[in-house]
Interface confidence: medium
Amino acid sequence: EVEKTACPSGKKAREIDESLIFYKKWELEACVDAALLATQMDRVNAIPFTYEQLDVLKHKLDELYPQGYPESVIQHLGYLFLKMSPEDIRKWNVTSLETLKALLEVNKGHEMSPQVATLIDRFVKGRGQLDKDTLDTLTAFYPGYLCSLSPEELSSVPPSSIWAVRPQDLDTCDPRQLDVLYPKARLAFQNMNGSEYFVKIQSFLGGAPTEDLKALSQQNVSMDLATFMKLRTDAVLPLTVAEVQKLLGPHVEGLKAEERHRPVRDWILRQRQDDLDTLGLGLQGGIPNGYLVLDLSMQEALS
C-alpha cells in the first residue's frame, strides 16, 4: 500500500504523459487522478513506466473500480495487464474480441499464464460458446489451446468453428477430446468431395469409430502411417487386413516399422497369419492357421 500524502504544489497531473516517469511512487499516488488515468489508459503503454510505478497505477484503478474494471479500461491496459492477478480478472466482463486480442498481444511469445487462462475463460463464458472468430484468435496465439480444454468445454464448440482448426492445433489432444471433436468435424466438412474431405478430417480421425474407418477404406484415401498410429485401438482392431491395405494404400509398407507399437501390434494379434502374409511385409504374430477365433466382445455383450 502507498501512503496517502498531499500532492506537492504544481505537480498535479493534467494528463498522462512522459513527465510522469520522473514521479516517485508517492507522487504518482498523490498527483494522478484515477478517473484521468482511466480515460487516458491508452497513453500508459507508450510511456516507459517502471514495474513499481505500474503497481501504483494499478492500485489507483483498483480503488476506482473495486467491482472490476470496465471494458473501456481493460482494452487499453497494455503492459499493465501483466500486473493483474487471476482474482482481478475474474471480476471483469470482457465481451469484445478486440479487447481479447489486445491483451493476448501483450503476452505474445510467452506460455499461457494463469492470467491469460482466466481471461480466456471469462471471455468464452461471456460469449456462451467458442465461436469461430474466438477460436481463430486463440489458436493463432496458442496453437495448443484447443487441447487444453476438457471434453465438456469442447462440447460447446459449434461445428462451424471447426473450420478454424489447423492440424497442429490438435497435436496434443487425447482420444477423449477427439471423441468430441470428430463428430463436429464430420458435420462441418460433410459437403466436401472425397479427397478434400479426407484432407480436412484427417487430423480428427483419432475420434473415429470402426465403421467410419471401413467407409474411408473404400475411398482410396491413402492414409499415412502417422495418422494411422493415432487412431483409437478399439476402432482399428475390427478392421480386416484387406481394409487396412485399402485404407493405407501405398503407405501399407510402413506397418512393418510399427509392428511393435500400438495400435499395429494389437491389430496384428487379431489377424490370421495367412491374411497378414498376403501383404508380403513379413508381419509376424497373427493367429496361426487352423485356430478358432472367438469374438470375446460379442460374447460379453450377450452375457
Partner: nanobody, 121 residues
C-alpha cells in the same frame, strides 16, 4: 431420417428428480455418434446439459455434473436424462439431440421438438 421425441412429466416438485426419455425412430440408435440433452430456460439462451458418445464416454456440463446422468438403451431405441435435486432454475424446455451417420458419408444433427418441464410445488 432420424426422428427424436422427448417424453416425461411436465411438472416436477423441487428437490425431486427430473426424468426424461428420448425415443428415436426412423433409424437405429446404435448408428449415432452421440446422444445429448440441451435445455432453454424461459427468456434465456440454450444450455448444453451433456452427451454420451459412440465410444461410451459421457460428458456433462461442469455446472450440472453432480446432478446429471445420461444413459442409452439400444434395445428400446431410447436414451434418457435424469437431473436430481431440481429447483425452479431448472424450469426449461428440454431438447434431446443426436448425430447420425456412423459409417455413412453424410451426417446430420437431429433435435426433438422439445418438452417444457416446470419445477414447482
Amino acid at each position: 431420417q432420424l426422428q427424436l421425441q422427448e417424453s416425461g412429466p411436465g411438472l416436477v416438485k423441487p428437490s425431486e428428480t427430473l426424468s426424461l426419455t428420448c425415443t428415436v425412430s426412423g433409424g437405429s440408435i446404435s448408428s449415432s455418434y452421440y446422444w445429448g440433452w440441451i435445455r432453454q430456460p424461459p427468456g434465456k439462451g440454450l444450455e448444453w446439459i451433456g452427451s454420451i458418445y459412440h465410444s461410451g464416454n459421457t460428458y456433462y456440463n461442469p455446472s450440472l455434473k453432480s446432478r446429471v446422468t445420461i444413459s442409452v438403451d439400444t434395445s428400446k431405441n431410447q436414451f434418457s436424462l435424469k437431473l436430481s435435486s431440481v429447483t425452479a432454475a431448472d424450469t426449461a424446455v428440454y431438447y434431446c439431440t443426436s448425430q447420425d451417420g456412423v459409417g455413412a458419408t453424410t451426417t446430420e444433427e437431429y433435435w426433438g421438438q422439445g418438452t417444457l418441464v416446470t419445477v414447482s410445488s
